[in-house]
Interface confidence: medium
């Protein structure tokens, strides 16, 4: 899930917590991130990044607990980290990414949090014990789970599924404001001496904020924004108000160079290299800064700010934001970027601006012609009609445009001549007196996925070549394989003939050359990530998902493809989930990727699996997975034995009863069997998963399962009162497969 | 003994409106986020709004067949929570029930109330 | 927002029988559903939640399975007070929506 530096997400918390298992993976920039709280009135439970540190601070009644990581290892450096605390019999461990860091006696009280849990941020929550912590989160919690259940979910509006390409953005990726409501917030933009701002703007909008830096003065800011398509910049100081225009046109959707430059005496705003600046009236005394640089858009306040000024700085443009980019990014001489923003709002990684426009006014027309020609290919929006000057010799009467296109048709990864029906003249070129050789056609955008080769000396680097190459055979369209259906050269046209014509021919013409490519079906392949031998413990089951094998097919969607298993069915291992006991001989890709198949071992050597895949149309040669079936060997990882009150309850968890197996990447089943009578107590297990509340019952059997849920535990029922310690000798055995170990 | 007594509900004309209360015991109701569900023919079981606890600013989010003509309101002294519904609407019609959760489990449903029937009619 | 199929709508059994019902979700929800029961002329009542842990109290004969966009209710062996409507609810993310019910009738 991605945060964004103000958002947060709650979950509820009824009852009091007595063990607590928290498991969380982030990672971030920022060295400052408020990753979790768990707030009671007194009670609290806060986890949070300072200074790139891990800190961790548990309120128990009166007690108070302090863990932190050491000052030497950073967790602001963008990489996954997994912080697991455990506060379990009255300690408290912290370990980071597998390591232990620190651990301390806690008092044995439940923590009390009936304000529940807050993640990524405390919201509007206002206790006195929140002063002085961090920000929130600007970053990704890719997990987070509180006694096995996760913590990130229902994920609200903006809080957003998996890790945000933002994050982890260079310098270099343009902040793209994909509006309507986007901000990015920087570190504050300090102009004591004097203060630059200098960013390469793209945008269509005529009215939009760029830049408010509030002042540390009530009322005091600087706002740069466009105001009727130009830049603006209005500083505001004490009692003066500086404003400031720049006759530079910005709203074209190009890109321009733009400089904001203040110190004491003036104000300077350049666009690309045209300035415009105040006189040196020294009206601008140094504004003390306060709060962040807003880019792009304006927060609640800022908008307030600008709306109660005086200069009626207008209601829409206060409420609207940028709707573009900005390349290049730099606060007095400092690089920034994304990953260095506080936070952000509807922002995107990259300018993908122009692109888009491109792609959606210019290619959207044959879309519908992707597979198959058209008989006639639609009227095109290019080139622009030309209306020819008066005077002009008879054959240009009614010209508009010099060329007929029809599309190239091409061959997945094939090659096909550009020919003469392809750019066919409109008109007589012999009456207008003009040869093929001075149609003169360059390439000014290629197509995505091939090349105009042109086998003429020189041509290629110049992209250039006339009619008569197209009719002698020389512009050929060489395919690259890929598997989109359409693409386009965009091809300028101008005529080099000294004869009367339009001088539209002269300066030239753009057209589109619509590409259609005629796919090709690729047999699909089955590919082994880990290698093809599988271990599975002797007479268990393990999953067969894309981590053991799958499909690799470029042109077929995961929905068309079909496994079959080969040989003879009966015996086969594979099986659905759901249907166990019913061999699977056949299944479709969809049903691997979702994990609803098993291997299922019942005994003697293990079956190896041979199987091949289809799209409909071929099929895939033979694969075969070798499968290993191994003993199962159990090894008692801890038995520590439990210390508890008489007439009390005390959970067994993992660091009281685990085995480790030699399962290879197998999630087994490990079964635990009470084997003798207890005398003072029963052995309990917990309904429900977990649940506050649910029953516990008498039970002769668990699974490691339910030990790692925290769902078993020893009541002690013994009414008689002791002199002494009464020591309950729990006997069990230990089942995986068929391998029992005994006398635990 | 968990309970979740209802009432309100009735007939009402198009654009009339409506409050519905639900009074919770058996549970530390301020502990407890609450949440109105209805149940029509044509649309079925549909969530239409939560209140969170006080300490979550009372966070509220609703769907957005409701959003702005209908709020959720919770009083923890009274330990009840409220739906107030404006301009009402034919498609409004239905049985409408107070739920709760209360548990990091997840946001299922663990206590309904009664149900009430709300019919928006001409 | 995320839409929930539930299938069959109806399903006519028999005392005994298993029975299984399946919700698919449009979207990625990974365990974060939850089944209820309903009776006529009463509200649904919690069975299952997290996929497959049952709800205090809820007898064993009552099992779910399913992570992802596939999900499934079983009753291995139905009881007579088991003929009602069974509906599933995902709260993976907001706004939390139901499927559209499975009614269970005597055959």
């Known amino acids: 899930a991605s945060f964004f530096g103000e958002n947060h997400l709650e979950v509820p918390v009824a009852t009091a917590l007595t063990d607590i298992d928290l498991q969380l993976q982030f990672s971030t920039s920022q060295p400052e991130a408020l990753l979790l709280l768990a707030a009671g009135p007194a009670d609290h439970l806060l986890l949070q990044l300072y200074s790139g540190r891990l800190q961790v601070r548990l309120v128990l009644g009166q007690e108070e607990l302090r863990l932190q990581t050491p000052a030497e290892t950073l967790l602001s450096d963008s990489i996954p980290h997994t912080v697991v605390l455990t506060v379990v019999e009255g300690w408290a461990t912290l370990s980071v990414d597998g390591f232990l860091n620190a651990s301390s006696a806690v008092p044995g009280a439940p923590l009390e949090v009936p304000y529940g849990l807050f993640v990524g941020g405390t919201g509007t929550l206002g206790l006195p014990y929140l002063r002085g912590t961090s920000r929130p989160l600007r970053g990704c919690l890719h997990a987070a789970t509180l006694n096995g259940r996760s913590l990130l979910r229902p994920l609200t509006p903006d809080v957003h599924e998996g890790c945000a390409e933002e994050f982890s953005a260079s310098d270099d990726v343009a902040l793209g404001f994909s509006g309507p409501h986007s901000l990015a917030a920087f570190p504050a933009w300090g102009t004591q001496d004097e203060g630059t701002l200098e960013f390469t703007l793209t945008t269509q909008s005529r009215q939009a904020p760029l830049a408010f830096q509030a002042g540390g003065r009530r009322g005091d800011f600087i706002y740069v924004d466009i105001f009727e398509g130009h830049l603006r910049a209005v500083v505001e100081k004490g009692q003066g108000t500086v404003l400031l225009h720049n006759s530079v046109p910005v709203a074209d959707g190009q890109p321009h160079e733009v400089s904001v430059h203040i110190n004491a005496h003036r104000l300077e705003i350049s666009v690309d290299q045209y300035p415009t600046h105040t006189s040196n009236r020294g009206v601008l005394s140094y504004l003390e800064p306060r709060g962040s640089l807003l880019l792009g858009g304006l927060d609640a306040e800022a908008s307030r700010h600008l709306q109660e000024h005086r200069l009626g700085l207008t209601p829409e443009a206060t409420n609207a934001s940028l709707l573009g980019c900005m390349e290049d990014l730099s606060v007095n001489g400092q690089r920034r970027g994304l990953r260095e923003a506080l936070l952000t709002r509807n922002m995107a990684a990259g300018c993908r601006l122009e692109e888009e426009e491109y792609e959606d006014d210019a290619y959207g027309h044959y879309e519908a012609f992707s597979t198959l020609a058209p008989e006639a290919w639609p009227a095109m929006e290019l080139p622009e009609p030309c209306v020819p000057e008066p005077g002009l010799p008879p054959v240009f009467a009614n010209f508009t445009q010099l060329l007929t296109i029809s599309p190239l048709v091409v061959a997945e990864g094939g090659t096909a001549w550009l020919e003469w029906r392809h750019v066919q003249p409109t008109l007589d070129l012999m009456e207008a007196e003009l040869r093929k050789s001075q149609v003169l056609f360059s390439v000014t955008r290629g197509a995505r996925h091939g090349e105009l080769e042109l086998d003429i000396p020189g041509a290629q680097a110049r992209k250039m070549f006339t009619l008569l190459d197209v009719v002698n055979r020389k512009a050929r369209f060489i395919h690259d394989g890929s598997e989109d259906t359409s693409d386009q050269l965009v091809l300028e046209v101008s005529v080099t003939a000294r004869v009367p014509m339009p001088s539209c021919l002269r300066r030239g013409q753009t057209y589109l050359l619509p590409i259609q490519v005629n796919p090709v079906n690729d047999p699909p392949h089955i590919i082994f990530p880990h290698g093809s031998l599988m271990v599975i413990l002797e007479h268990t089951q393990k999953p067969l998902g894309p981590e053991v094998f799958q499909a690799y097919d470029p042109d077929s969607a995961c929905e068309g493809l079909t496994f079959q298993v080969l040989g003879t069915s009966s015996g086969l291992p594979v099986e659905r989930r759901d249907q166990p006991g019913e061999p699977a001989t056949e299944f479709s890709c969809r049903e691997l990727e979702a994990g609803s198949l098993v291997y299922v071992h019942r005994g003697g050597p293990a079956q190896d699996l041979t199987f091949r895949v289809s799209d409909g149309l071929q099929a895939s040669p033979p694969a075969t997975l070798k499968v290993v079936a191994i003993r199962p060997a159990i090894q008692i990882h801890r038995s520590t034995g439990l210390r508890l009150a008489q007439g009390s309850a005390m959970p067994i968890l993992p660091a009281n009863l685990s085995v480790e197996t030699n399962a290879v990447g197998q999630d087994v089943s490990v079964l635990f069997r009470v084997t003798g009578a207890l005398q003072f107590g029963e052995l309990q297990k917990q309904g429900a998963g977990g649940v506050e509340g649910a029953e516990w019952w008498a039970t002769q059997a668990f699974h490691q399962r339910d030990v790692e849920q925290g769902r078993v535990r020893y009541l002690s029922t013994d009414p008689q009162h002791h002199a002494y310690d009464t020591v309950e000798n729990l006997a069990l055995e230990v089942q995986v497969g068929q391998e029992i170990l005994s006398n635990l | 003994q968990v309970k979740l007594q209802q009432s309100g509900g009735g007939l009402v004309q198009p654009g009339g409106s409506m409050k519905l209360s639900c009074v919770v015991s058996?549970?530390?109701?301020?502990?407890?986020?609450m949440n109105w569900v209805r149940q029509s023919p044509e649309k079925g079981l549909e969530w239409i709004a939560e209140?969170?606890?006080?300490?979550?600013?009372?966070?509220?989010y609703y769907a957005e067949s409701v959003k702005g003509r209908f709020t959720i309101s919770r009083d923890d002294s009274k330990s009840s929570a409220y739906l107030q519904m404006i301009n009402l609407r034919a498609e409004d019609t239905g049985i409408y029930y107070c739920?709760?959760?209360?548990?990091?489990?997840?946001?299922?449903?663990?206590?309904w109330g009664q149900g009430t029937t709300v019919t928006v009619s001409s | 927002d995320i839409q929930l199929t539930q299938s069959p709508s109806f399903l006519s059994a028999s005392v005994g029988d298993r029975v299984t019902i399946t919700c698919k979700a449009s979207?990625?929800?990974?365990?974060?559903v939850a089944w209820y029961q309903q009776k006529p002329g009463k509200a649904p009542e919690p069975l299952l939640f997290?996929?497959?842990y049952r709800y205090t109290g809820v007898p064993s004969r009552f099992s779910g399975s399913g992570s992802g966009t596939e999900f499934t209710l079983t009753i291995s062996s139905l009881q007579p007070e088991d003929f009602a409507t069974y509906y599933c609810?995902?709260?993976?993310?907001?706004?939390?929506?139901f499927g559209g019910g499975t009614k269970v009738e005597i055959k």
């Open positions: 739920t709760s959760y209360g548990n990091y489990v997840g946001h299922y449903f663990d206590h």
């Open positions: 609810q995902q709260y993976n993310s907001y706004p939390l929506t």
């Open positions: 997290s996929a497959s």
């Open positions: 979207q990625n929800v990974d365990t974060n």
């Open positions: 209140i969170r606890l006080k300490s979550n600013n009372f966070g509220r």
């Open positions: 058996g549970f530390t109701f301020s502990n407890y986020w």
